[in-house]
């Protein structure tokens, strides 16, 4: 019996009955065995078929078989109810080999011409399976010439059988206090040949509780305990399971903070698996009772390990642990069922004793010594000589623990000295002057330091003077001996002040005229204001109206008198303001250089002379009465004049203070 072609020869060709296309003889038997390469199959079809027809093709036939399976037994020319002829059918081997057998019996009633067939090897598409048959691959099947291969979706790995996809389902660790885990693909069927390990690992002190939820379906066996697929639960104390079947296992209270769940599947079955919802519990901490005037947040039925609460105090109360203040308080429940810190108190805010007010006093309004939340105090300044600046002096103890004014200020009010008070109710280089009485010129300052000069007290720690009077001491402020509160130049009874810094106007040039002849001395301490020591006021914007030509100003000092000596007693002189053009003209003739009198100067004195300021009065104030406020203000600073004090046709020249208000204010606010 011819074998036919065998691989690796080319697998295609023609088969025909003996004698074809002539009639075939009786008692013939012919067998062909065709073999294709692995992964290929054989395709066969007939181009001519003419065999004797007999019941179930018992006489003459062509039989096609592949392995042990008969694919077809063929006879006749056309198919009948019980016999089959090939017609246009194509036949395929089941594997890579095909057997063809031709047989004729002992007789033919008439001549039959037999058959002609063609065959060829073709690739098998292993990925195509008949309905109802198991798929070739678990997930993805890839056909190629001569074979196929399988691959898996993400999260799976190809089993060593090269067809099954095993789940990559180990090493998952759950650390949250509750959660869910399930078999792979749940609720769809779980994968075959898989071994899954899940870990729940909570902090020490927690105990894991497992609840099986929704559905449970793991392949089982009626007699043997879970021989195929199973679920096991392991703790450090005990093992639960194995579990399989269709009944939801009961809740498992593991009494452990670590749990390992193992799920193993075999190669067969179609089951949906399982789902576990896990929670945890721990030893509860004592229920937190809020301190008086406080509340707990969040409010829970119970507090267990890692749970926390915070305490919030009502407005006007503050968190204190003993004497120590806290901005916030949070306690955490520990594994032994205790809180990690004790409960604080919500204590009423206490602003404490209010600070002393320099030159003022404080009065408790709410009650003697009451300094707690919403308590009220009243600051006031020492009458007559001080006035309160900015606010009304009423302060409330607020929730932040600070005494706060009605304007929201937390700083103390300021008792500012009242300026421009004088014992004189009306208005001499004091030359031709009169003796001053106590309280007449309480702003008068005596400056000693090389020469005798004067100044005027501003506020309670500044002295206004002439630049030329303190120029030599500008770098050695401490050399200035500053005295106030006395009438007698040589008296041992005076208030001593010392200079902290000297500020000379940047526009002043020493020994080159007297323009910008103005300076400020900052005292190193505030002086106490009284009837003998009171600051002079600075001019208001409207002050020019009290300093017109012929308006009377008063100059005071210990300068030279008519007798040619420094005055022992403070002297003063009332002198009128001189027209500026008239004064300029008076100083345009020699020996004075042109432009000696500038717009930053004002002149005062009598045309007839006799009343003037003189050497030793330099830096002192030329003051005017503001009739609206009834306060004295400084209009001029004794600066320069004729060599002969009180000379007719010559006038005393003063620095015009109103021109320097911004300069004065800037220096005082900056320093």
């Amino acid at each position: 019996t011819p074998l036919g072609p065998k691989w690796p020869e080319p697998v295609f060709g023609r088969l025909a009955s003996p004698g074809f296309p002539g009639e075939y003889a009786n008692d013939q038997e012919r067998r062909w065995t065709l073999t294709a390469p692995p992964g290929y199959r054989l395709r066969l079809y007939f181009t001519h078929f003419d065999l004797e027809l007999s019941h179930l093709c018992e006489y003459d036939f062509v039989k096609l078989s592949s392995g042990a399976k008969v694919l077809a037994t063929l006879c006749g020319q056309e198919s009948t109810d019980t016999e089959r002829a090939p017609g246009k059918d194509t036949f395929y081997s089941l594997g890579s080999s095909l057997d063809i057998t031709f047989r004729s019996d002992y007789s033919n009633e008439k001549p039959f011409t037999g058959f002609e067939a063609f065959y060829a090897a073709e690739d098998i598409d292993e990925c195509q399976v008949a309905p109802g048959e198991a798929p070739t691959c678990d997930h993805h099947c890839h056909n190629h010439l001569g074979g196929f291969y399988c691959s898996c979706r993400a999260g799976y790995v190809l089993h060593r059988n090269k067809r099954t996809c095993s789940a990559l389902c180990s090493g998952q660790v759950f650390t949250q206090r509750s959660g869910e885990l399930s078999s792979p693909e749940y609720p769809r069927p779980y994968p075959k040949l898989s071994s899954c390990t899940y870990s729940i690992s909570l902090e020490e002190g927690f105990s894991v509780i497992l609840d099986f939820v929704e559905s449970f379906d793991v392949e089982t066996h009626p007699e043997t305990l879970c021989p195929y697929d199973f679920l096991k639960i392991q703790t450090d104390r005990e093992e639960h399971g194995p579990f399989c079947g269709k009944t939801l296992p009961h809740r498992i209270e593991t009494k452990s903070n670590t749990v390992t769940i193992t799920f193993v599947t075999d190669e067969s079955g179609d089951h949906t698996g399982w789902k576990i919802h896990y929670t945890s519990t721990a030893q509860p901490c004592p229920y937190p009772m809020a301190p008086p005037n406080g509340h707990v947040s969040p409010v829970q039925a119970k507090y267990i390990l890692k749970d926390s609460f915070s305490i919030f105090c009502e407005t006007g109360y503050e968190l204190l642990q003993g004497h120590l203040p806290l901005k916030s308080f949070t306690a955490v429940c520990q594994k032994d069922g205790s809180w990690d810190r004790p409960m604080p108190a919500c204590s009423i805010v206490d602003c404490g004793p209010p600070d002393d007010l320099p030159s003022g006093r404080v009065e408790y309004i709410t009650g003697p010594g009451v300094t707690t939340y919403k308590a009220v105090i009243q600051y006031s300044c020492e009458e007559t000589f001080y006035t309160m600046k900015v606010n009304d002096g009423k302060y409330v103890c607020e929730a932040d623990g600070f005494w706060t004014s009605s304007k929201g200020e937390k700083s103390l009010p300021v008792c500012e000295p009242v300026c421009g008070l004088s014992a004189r109710t009306t208005g001499g280089r004091i030359y031709g002057g009169q003796k001053a009485k106590p309280g007449d010129f309480p702003w008068q300052v005596l400056i000693l330091g090389g020469t005798t000069a004067a100044g005027a007290l501003l506020y309670d720690n500044w002295v206004l003077t002439a630049a030329h009077a303190v120029y030599e001491q500008k770098h050695d402020a401490s050399a200035l001996d500053i005295r106030m509160g006395t009438l007698k130049r040589l008296s041992p009874h005076y208030t001593q002040a010392w200079s902290e810094a000297v500020f000379i106007h940047e526009g002043y040039t020493h020994d080159a005229g007297f323009d910008n002849d103005i300076a400020l001395i900052k005292l190193n301490n505030k002086v106490v204001i009284n009837s003998n020591i009171t600051p002079i006021c600075l001019p208001r914007k409207e002050a020019e109206s009290f300093m017109r030509t012929d308006d009377i100003g008063t100059a005071s000092g210990w300068g030279l008198t008519q007798r040619g000596f420094l005055a022992r007693n403070l002297m003063y002189v009332d002198i009128p303001i001189v027209d500026h053009q008239k004064c300029t003209a008076a100083y345009e003739k020699p020996p004075y250089p042109r432009g000696s009198v500038t717009a930053n100067m004002l002149c005062a004195g009598l045309e007839s002379g006799g009343k003037d300021s003189c050497r030793g009065d330099s830096g002192g104030a030329l003051v005017f009465l503001d009739s609206e406020t009834e306060r004295w203000f400084v209009g001029g600073i004794v600066s320069w004049g004729s060599m002969n004090c009180g000379e007719a046709g010559q006038y005393g020249v003063y620095t015009k203070v109103i021109n320097y208000i911004p300069w004065i204010e800037n220096i005082i606010s900056d320093f």
Partner: antibody
Framework: DVQLQESGPGLVKPSQSLSLTCTVT?????????WNWIRQFPGNTLEWMGY???????SYNPSLIGRISITRDTTKNQFFLQLNSVSTEDTATYYC???????????WGQGTSVTVSS | NIVMTQSQQFMSTSVGDRVSVTCKAS??????VAWYQQKPGQSPKALIY???YRYSGVPDRFTGSGSGTDFTLTISNVQSEDLAEYFC????????FGSGTKLELK
């Protein structure tokens, strides 16, 4: 980590003022807690001097009221001690410390030695 | 001011021993007491707060107890590194330290 560092002169003359600075790193002094000055005299006795709280409020040892002032500069995360009219009895090692009564760790500076002597 | 009295200035002990350092307040301070350990040349280190709460990182051989006026710091199984001076601090009303107890080897 919270760190505190004291700085200031090691020698002060009697009747003068003692001024020390505590520089805090790793935590804002306005966030919470009390920021204290504590001193340790020769012989190891510890004395709490006072604190400035996160809000800027101060509390002083009653025995030092009138001489002590604690202030702060929140922009530099520093707080300061000023002790006026010092005498030889104020010779000590001065520590700045964050004290919280258990609400967070206590942290101390390494201390700075101050001698009052003419 | 509340006075905190540590009656024993020195205490002798051996490695492995159990020792108790006591502190008495002149008036009720609730549980607002802390304990500190100080070694020569170092700043104090906090051990216990609120009378009985141990700071994290402090070995559990250190325990604190007491409330009101009487407080105790107990060191069980004394180690050589525990030889130091121990101070109590009350922070109930202002802050005051005890005078200190020095733990030394027998």
């Amino acid at each position: 980590d919270v760190q505190l560092q004291e700085s200031g002169p090691g020698l002060v003359k009697p009747s003068q003022s003692l001024s020390l600075t505590c520089t805090v790193t790793g935590y804002s002094i306005t966030s919470d807690y009390a920021w204290n000055w504590i001193r340790q005299f020769p012989g190891n006795t510890l004395e709490w001097m006072g604190y400035i709280s996160y809000s800027g409020r101060t509390s002083y040892n009653p025995s030092l009221i009138g001489r002590i002032s604690i202030t702060r500069d929140t922009t530099k995360n520093q707080f300061f001690l000023q002790l006026n009219s010092v005498s030889t009895e104020d010779t000590a090692t001065y520590y700045c410390a964050k004290l919280a009564g258990g609400h967070g760790m206590d942290y101390w500076g390494q201390g700075t030695s101050v001698t009052v002597s003419s | 001011n509340i006075v905190m009295t540590q009656s024993q200035q020195f205490m002798s002990t051996s490695v492995g021993d159990r020792v108790s350092v006591t502190c008495k307040a002149s008036q009720n301070v609730d549980t607002n007491v802390a304990w500190y350990q100080q070694k020569p040349g170092q700043s104090p280190k906090a051990l216990i707060y609120s009378a009985s709460y141990r700071y994290s990182g402090v070995p559990d051989r250190f325990t604190g107890s007491g409330s009101g006026t009487d407080f105790t710091l107990t060191i069980s199984n004394v180690q050589s590194e525990d030889l130091a001076e121990y101070f109590c601090l009350q922070y109930n009303s202002y802050l005051t330290f005890g005078s200190g107890t020095k733990l030394e080897l027998k």
